[in-house]
Amino acid sequence: ATSCPQNVNISGGTFTLSHGWAPGSLLIYSCPQGLYPSPASRLCKSSGQWQTPRATRSLTKAVCKPVRCPAPVSFENGIYTPRLGSYPVGGNVSFECEDGFILRGSPVRQCRPNGMWDGETAVCDNGAGHCPNPGISLGAVRTGSRFGHGDKVRYRCSSNLVLTGSAERECQGNGVWSGTEPICRQPYSYDFPEDVAPALGTSFSHMLGATNPTQRTKESLGRKIQIQRSGHLNLYLLLDSSQSVSENDFLIFKESASLMVDRIFSFEINVSVAIITFASEPKVLMSVLNVNSRDITEVISSLENAKYKDHENGTGTNTYAALNSVYLMMNNQMQLLGMKTMAWQEIRHAIILLTDGKSNMGGSPKTAVDQIREILNINQKRNDYLDIYAIGVGKLDVDWRELNELGSKKDGERHAFILQDTKALHQVFEHMLDVSKLTDTICGVGNMSANASDQERTPWHVTIKPKSQETCRGALISDQWVLTAAHCFRDGNDHSLWRVNVGDPKSQWGKEFLIEKAVISPGFDVFAKKNQGILEFYGDDIALLKLAQKVKMSTHARPICLPCTMEANLALRRPQGSTCRDHENELLNKQSVPAHFVALNGSKLNINLKMGVEWTSCAEVVSQEKTMFPNLTDVREVVTDQFLCSGTQEDESPCKGESGGAVFLERRFRFFQVGLVSWGLYNPCLGSADKNSRKRAPRSKVPPPRDFHINLFRMQPWLRQHLGDVLNFLPL
């Protein structure tokens, strides 16, 4: 059998083969960060010879060359230093403006290992035009220097750089430039996941009904709320499974798409998902016309059933046919719903194309995009009804021009990306969608990204304090109600002296609220069982506080989901007829359930809630506690089934001041409060004035640490009695 020669090493780099040394196999070179391979790949021909794309000679020696970033071609109304033909990785370029001009963007930019500049385009602007000066990105040349309403500017890139973004932009009536900023990049450059995730996420969040409060100062950013919760989104996932995609990479495409689907369903919008795999021909695995496209389990299942081998007979990359099958799907749906109906016109459409190369058959994919734009009547007014994300993976044969042509162009957003590999793609999809920026009272959303603040991660978390020192914690369960522990109020202080501190994006200290009323469980009496040798009893340790004003929802303040409510049911994506018992079964679904509480310093700490038969072994050590319970005869009188138990294994123990805080868990990227911190056998903060200092109990401690949390599933009648008109409760 024919095979290609094996003398294809690259000095300083490595290579992988898609199908061994056999004809049809793609050899892909890779180099350490800061270097790029030249050539990037070779293809084993049926003749047994390696072919290098776009090479004149049949076999050039492969080398790793240093990555460089493009130099500014011109910089208006200012100067830049140093002036070089191109810049090495780690090199800086600095910008200064002439008198009378203000610098917008980054004054210093550094060349990154992917051949891209960090920061934002520097612009020297005097604010004279109807639109701001759109600037000239590094490596670009602009024609057009008038910025009045209707004026156009055009861009091209110098030498062999590739333009991504809009080659032409127009100053619109609202003072915003049409399209998206053009960037000139090296053909071998690629995007880092940490850049793509927020860029993709910002765009996607806008489409999903999110404004981005952190960026409201830039008026060009933040399309207003697009999809109300009654709106509908059609999401079309197009997965390349052509020959150049290895089976392993195809699996990662699938996994990434699954992550995407999982996240998208965690927004409480109506969504239908189509799944199309393609090589020479497309294969529709799920159509938006199928009622199952609205059901996450069905969508994920059809994704899981996508087979790499489905396309083994046709191994080209026919992106046109894939996009055309989206067009046909749209056309069928339009016929079904009626072209003039709101039902059709109000559907928003998002296409995500995951590909590893450029289309090599079937004609220009741009033709299909034009048809799609036409059928959806995409014009300046309806621009928000279509988003096409073109994501190239693997630096090889991905065609920047084609990706750029396919991706949507929207101001302040990017829709075309190239990632180094499928691992990077996976990272992007993991961190891309952040529901925490939604402005309505959607519950249980915390920002999970690595750079989020503690309060953004747990925006329901509040501090309850009298005028003097902090005493307790609590959780927002609506925009005006806080759930906490009754024992925080056992001294009977006038609650008008108390304050509730709620997270606020404008202040690291949060915002103080007065308490309109405190509802303390009448069953709570810490001395109720004194005559049974139980000096302190925490049954019914639950209270509700109504704040004097409503809390404005933000990244820092948002309610947690309470189980057994419609709100939580939506977040869990459970069917409509679900009951409270269903929620308990889903949330407390193991003998040991990983959960969290929030520490005095705001960090999220881990515990394991012991359930079922393990609950008793967790709870029974209380009988060894002789200080709190000197003459205890029946441990069941202290630890009733109102309590959840933690404190075994490597669990953290809550401190005294953490009482009343939520005990919560994460499901489907949303957070649910199952308990509230009540009492325990060990205080890890005892004797420490430092909020960050906690001491673990010595292993020899008798009794060992145990912590008890009011189980919200056992407090349903009381919660329903007081929150019946605030939350929508499910049947028990």
């Epitope: 079964n585 359930m611 079922g612 038969v613 609950w615 008793t616 069941r636 089934d641």
Partner: antibody, heavy 122, light 108 residues
């Protein structure tokens, strides 16, 4: 509404292996909060717990039967099964499958199957 | 010991109150659960925990516990309450369960 239904042979010969299956509808055997249980009742006598299984694979058995009994769960079919080796006349009983639930200090069986009578005779 | 002891038979006049008891060491740690079984039928859970009734069980059934003894009380016994009553509880670790020998309740 949760329903359990036992199935398996009614007549056995001594020393054979008894295999019973319980099919669960209206609920899932992979739910992590329940203990899928077999209980038997010899004619005219009281209830005897045979064993319980948690979907993750942990099983507990009556010490008097431990050497002969195996309980397993098949999540794909939403079923759990009982295997009792080397049956004898002493194993003749009505066999129930049931769903066990542990809450606080109590442990109870909230749903039962309709029962299957197993006769052992040579 | 892992035994639960019940009186084999108890009788009660219609409309009167009757108490059925269950004794065993495990009841010092765990609450008993109670089941009613009528001839030819599967047992039905009537009480669990300290004193909890599943939905559909009349409130004339109540439970209590003291030391190593658990009690099921029927206040105002009805003819349809005539049945065998079994108690059960966990013992030791895991899901080990023990049943009482059963009490046959006759309503006169």
């Amino acid at each position: 509404q949760v329903q359990l239904r036992e199935s398996g042979p009614g007549l056995m010969k001594p020393s054979e292996t008894l295999s019973l299956t319980c099919t669960v509808s209206g609920g899932s055997v992979s739910s992590g909060v329940y203990y899928w249980t077999w209980i038997r009742q010899p004619p005219g006598k009281g209830l005897e717990w045979i064993g319980s299984m948690f979907y993750s694979g942990n099983a507990d058995y009556n010490p008097s039967l431990k050497s002969r009994v195996t309980i397993s769960v098949d999540t794909s079919k939403n079923q759990f099964s009982l295997r009792l080796n080397s049956v004898s006349a002493a194993d003749m009983a009505v066999y129930y499958c049931a769903r066990g639930y542990a809450s606080g200090w109590s442990y109870y069986f909230d749903y039962w199957g309709q029962a299957t009578l197993v006769t052992v005779s040579s | 010991s892992s035994e639960l002891t019940q009186d084999p038979t108890v009788s009660v006049a219609l409309g009167q109150t009757v108490r059925i008891t269950c004794q065993g060491d495990s009841l010092r740690t765990y609450y008993a659960s109670w089941y009613q079984q009528k001839p030819g039928q599967a047992p039905v859970l009537v009480l669990y925990g300290k004193n909890n009734r599943p939905s559909g069980i009349p409130d004339r059934f109540s439970g209590s516990s003291s030391g190593n003894t658990a009690s099921l009380t029927i206040t105002g016994a009805q003819a349809e309450d005539e049945a065998d009553y079994y108690c059960n509880s966990r013992y030791s670790s895991g899901t080990h369960v023990v049943f009482g020998g059963g009490t046959k309740l006759t309503v006169l």
